[in-house]
């Protein structure tokens, strides 16, 4: 008899999830010599252990600690790039500026980027039909807790001048409810981080407003300053320049600036 399966509001686990994670891990460790020591089977086992057989609305950051431990990685000071609501452009940037890193350029972020997963209580099966939606079902689901965990860790380990790319086309340029606003901002360590520099990316071709004066940016400045971290903001126009460099990765002058 087919077993009854809980119906969640969100889409189910990405097809071929175990194979995808394992393949990504192998690829990452091949490309990044400093991570060659990582055993990808152990990584998958730790990943699986965080959510398999567990009620998918009761996942904790503790569940992911074995995985976090295996994926420990450090970013050089001044090279961390956070982002909010502008993922693709942030990734285009680090694709060109190879010495800067978003969370998705690190092993754990790379493994999980754009994937969905969940299991079921008391069974070893992966649920490919549906997974909990953050709004409609619960916030302590496997995907949300994963990103909260690794985002917290990413922010905690950042040092020097940290950059954040923000979407100037959104009504809330800085959103307190985003992962950046709710997790990363509060986990930057004042004793290690000397400044946060926000890059507000303008969308409009003819846009020449000063979005660094936006009330939500003032709010971000206030939060950061209260944490004894200096705050800077820059208007960034012509985001199409990022893609132009990405299209020609062989052009080394795109990488170095000049």
């Amino acid at each position: 008899l087919p077993r009854w399966r809980q119906q969640w509001s969100g889409s189910g686990t990405t097809s071929r999830f175990p194979e995808t994670v394992l393949a990504r891990c192998v690829k990452y460790t091949e490309v990044h010599p400093e991570m060659r020591h990582v055993d990808c089977q152990s990584v998958w086992d730790a990943f699986k252990g965080a959510f398999i057989s567990k009620y998918p609305c009761n996942i904790t950051e503790e569940d992911y600690q074995p995985l976090v431990k295996l994926g420990t990685q450090t970013v050089p000071c001044n090279k961390t790039l956070l982002w909010s609501r502008i993922k693709d452009l942030a990734h285009q940037f680090t694709q060109v500026q190879r010495d800067m890193f978003t969370l998705e350029d690190m092993l754990l972020g790379y493994l999980a980027d754009d994937l969905t997963w969940c299991g079921e209580f008391n069974t070893f099966e992966i649920n490919y039909q549906s997974c909990p939606d953050w709004r409609k079902d619960c916030s302590n689901n496997p995907v949300s807790v994963f990103w909260k965990t690794v985002s917290r860790r990413f922010a905690e380990t950042a040092c020097g001048v940290v950059h954040v790319m923000l979407n100037g086309s959104r009504s809330k340029i800085f959103d307190k409810n985003s992962t950046f606003g709710s997790v990363e901002v509060h986990n930057l360590q004042p004793e290690k981080v000397q400044a946060l520099e926000a890059w507000v990316i303008h969308g409009g071709r003819e846009d020449s407003r000063d979005l660094c004066q936006d009330p939500t940016i003032k709010e971000l400045e206030s939060i950061i300053s209260k944490r004894n971290i200096r705050f800077f903001c820059k208007n960034i126009y012509r985001p199409d320049k990022f893609l132009q460099c990405v299209k020609n990765p062989e052009d080394s002058s795109c990488l170095s600036g000049i």
Partner: antibody, heavy 120, light 108 residues
Framework: QVQLVESGGGLVQPGGSLRLSCAAS????????MNWVRQAPGKGLEWVSG????????YYADSVKGRFTISRDNSKNTLYLQMNSLRAEDTAVYYC?????????????WGQGTLVTVSS | DIELTQPPSVSVAPGQTARISCSGD??????VYWYQQKPGQAPVLVIY???KRPSGIPERFSGSNSGNTATLTISGTQAEDEADYYC??????????FGGGTKLTVLG
Amino acid sequence: QVQLVESGGGLVQPGGSLRLSCAASGFTFSSYYMNWVRQAPGKGLEWVSGISGDPSNTYYADSVKGRFTISRDNSKNTLYLQMNSLRAEDTAVYYCARDLPLVYTGFAYWGQGTLVTVSS
Amino acid sequence: DIELTQPPSVSVAPGQTARISCSGDNLRHYYVYWYQQKPGQAPVLVIYGDSKRPSGIPERFSGSNSGNTATLTISGTQAEDEADYYCQTYTGGASLVFGGGTKLTVLG
């Protein structure tokens, strides 16, 4: 190494036209915004026009809008500036300049310039 | 449009520090670039992104940008640094502006 060589300058009467060219080499031309900047004799620098790498976006200073047209041929690694309805105040050395990439909008490399003189 | 204001001239003794200012409304919200231009030559980028030095530019050149003012600092100024210096910024659309330029004179 990066090289930018302007040509096409000369003496032209007010109301006349001129087409400047800039031959680029030493970098992937289509990756960069390109610009024209001018300098009147004994005066400061003035940005004239810019064009994106693809080249779907063009920008003009108010002083030349409607009279000048910037264009590029990525297959020939060449930047152009078509100047119509020229005025005495357009007299200047015209420089072709390559933009910085990514978040920066300044000029990494400049040509040696070509002199445009508008006079009757 | 933002307007960039520079002093017309700055004088400095050899070996001393020269500071050239560039002011504009909320200039700290925009990246600033500095160019050196010697007579009869094309401008050369000496500082980009407020404070970054292109390769080949001596370490004595540095830049900063806070409040409404960006500053180009030349430490241990040498005779060869005598030139015109221009600041520049970009405030979107067709608003790419240069300051009026500062003539740096190295005395002696």
